[in-house]
């Protein structure tokens, strides 16, 4: 059985069949006599009860609200109500891209490693019994595959496999032909094994400061998920109440690695903060990398060549 629609925010493409299935379905069967209602609210109107009479495109079956098909004006909030159970969804219907076989905003991205197993299977369990045929397209060019009920690609991944794969299911309902499109953006990468982590920027940084002011030293690295980045300063970390390590920020790169940055904030800079090493280290099983920062009083800048300064 098709699982219920648990996502509260849903984006769909106009002109395709679509359904909402509430998540107390098994419960609803047990209490057949209980009143079950579907409502819609949009900007202009509040809580309008839905039934097949409200639109020829809407069908109600047990736990499901079906659209044949969904259209732009179906955008809004939908509610299912049964006794003291309520479920709400926010539906956003977007315009179909008429110049392509798929709509860019409705694409699922996948990263596959080269020479590893690459699989795409075209399935749609909810509409399975109504599907006449299914076609698989790569970059909107139809692939001639053996099985036209559930076309499948299973192969060793190659760089040339990169692209947009669209499963298009063709189905009939009440004498009309509909299609449902599911598109995958497949990116082929070399591999996602561990890299040797590296700190970005020069290994030694002189930072010009003024006494009594604050400074933020930013340490950035390219690293693996399990690697750590940390600051070392003074004889005992944490002995200076004016020095604070900020929360580490991480962003995933397209290759599946991480770009991390950790800021060391020095407040109310004093003489004791000048001309000492503030070391940032990235550590992993593959080794470590360290870069150093030295705070220099602005007045002393003339003694240091220009190329060693960082902002």
């Amino acid at each position: 059985a098709e699982s219920c629609t648990s996502r509260p925010h849903i984006t769909v493409v106009e002109g395709e069949p679509f359904y909402l299935k509430h998540c107390s379905c098994s419960l609803a069967h047990e209490i057949e006599t209980t009143t079950k209602s579907w409502y819609k609210s949009s900007g202009s109107q509040e809580h309008v009860e839905l039934n097949p009479r409200s639109s020829s495109r809407i069908a109600l079956h047990d736990c499901v609200l079906e659209f044949w098909p969904v259209e732009l004006n179906d955008t809004g909030s939908y509610f299912f109500q049964m006794k003291n159970y309520t479920q709400k969804w926010k539906l956003n219907v977007i315009r179909r891209n008429k110049h392509s076989c798929f709509t860019e905003r409705q694409v699922t991205s996948k990263i596959v490693e080269v020479k590893k197993f690459f699989q795409i299977t075209c399935e749609n369990s909810y509409y399975q019994t109504l599907v006449n045929s299914t076609s698989l397209y790569k970059n909107c060019k139809k692939l001639l595959l053996e099985n036209n009920k559930n076309p499948t690609i299973k192969k060793n991944a190659e760089f040339e496999d990169q692209g947009y794969y669209s499963c298009v299911h063709f189905l009939h309902h009440n004498g009309k032909l509909f299609n449902i499109t599911k598109t995958f953006n497949i990116t082929i990468v070399e591999d996602r094994s561990n890299i040797v982590p590296v700190l970005l920027g020069p290994k030694l940084n002189h930072v010009a400061v003024e006494l009594g002011k604050n400074v933020r030293l930013n340490c950035s690295a390219l690293l693996n998920e399990e690697d750590v980045i940390y600051w070392m300063f003074g004889e005992e970390n944490g002995s200076d109440p004016n020095i604070h390590e900020e929360k580490e920020m991480r962003i995933m790169t397209p290759e599946g690695k991480w770009h991390a940055s950790k800021v060391l904030r020095i407040e109310n800079i004093g003489e004791s903060n000048l001309n000492v090493l503030y070391n940032c280290t990235v550590a992993s099983t593959g080794g470590t990398d360290t870069k150093s920062f030295i705070l220099v009083r602005k007045a002393d800048m003339a003694d240091i060549p220009g190329h060693v300064f960082t902002r």
Epitope: E113, K115, F117, K138, L143, L144, L145, E146, I153, K154, K155, N156, E158, E160, D161, E190, D191, R192, S193, N194, I195
Partner: antibody, heavy 118, light 112 residues
Amino acid sequence: QVQLVQSGAEVKKPGASVKVSCKASGYTFTGYYMHWVRQAPGQGLEWMGWINPNSGGTNYAQKFQGRVTMTRDTSISTAYMELSRLRSDDTAVYYCARDMGDLFFDYWGQGTLVTVSS
Amino acid sequence: DIVMTQSPDSLAVSLGERATINCKSSQSVFYSSNNKNYLAWFQQKPGQPPKLLIYWASTRESGVPDRFSGSGSGTDFTLTISSLQAEDVAVYYCQQYFITWTFGQGTKVEIK
């Protein structure tokens, strides 16, 4: 010219491990994946897995998962295949083979005979 | 895994005669997106490693004599030696590289 030179024959006891090396020359070692294939006496060829010498990334055949480890040392252009918990049916000639980029193998090492016997 | 089955297991052919080896895969190794068959043929002489003869089912590796040719598509493939020479005595293997990598059991070619 491209050459893959493997380490010499080994005799091992059941339960032990063996590490076979494959030294590459005549091409950029990190530019091509390296596969390992074995051949039991009088038998056919069996794919074991590959290593990407550039990153150290690996992909092992399901049959060998947990027993095989493929590594490399880029400084000496050498790939290694270590097989642990050896059994008598691991007696075979082990080959390294270069993947020329299109999934098929264009150059092979001369082979290393590994005999597992008590 | 894709199972590769070669026939015959052994073959005796007179010098100068044609030798034909068949290879059948348990599922298609043809990919319509690039019109390629993911199949290679190897030659292995006693005490030597396999040597690549043919890839993409019909492309001859450089340096391989033109008496060797590959044909077929989908699940059925053939390696043909148009005029057998003494140095062609060997075991020949087909290999698919479409889903992981698997080899046929080999065909031994001898002189009659």
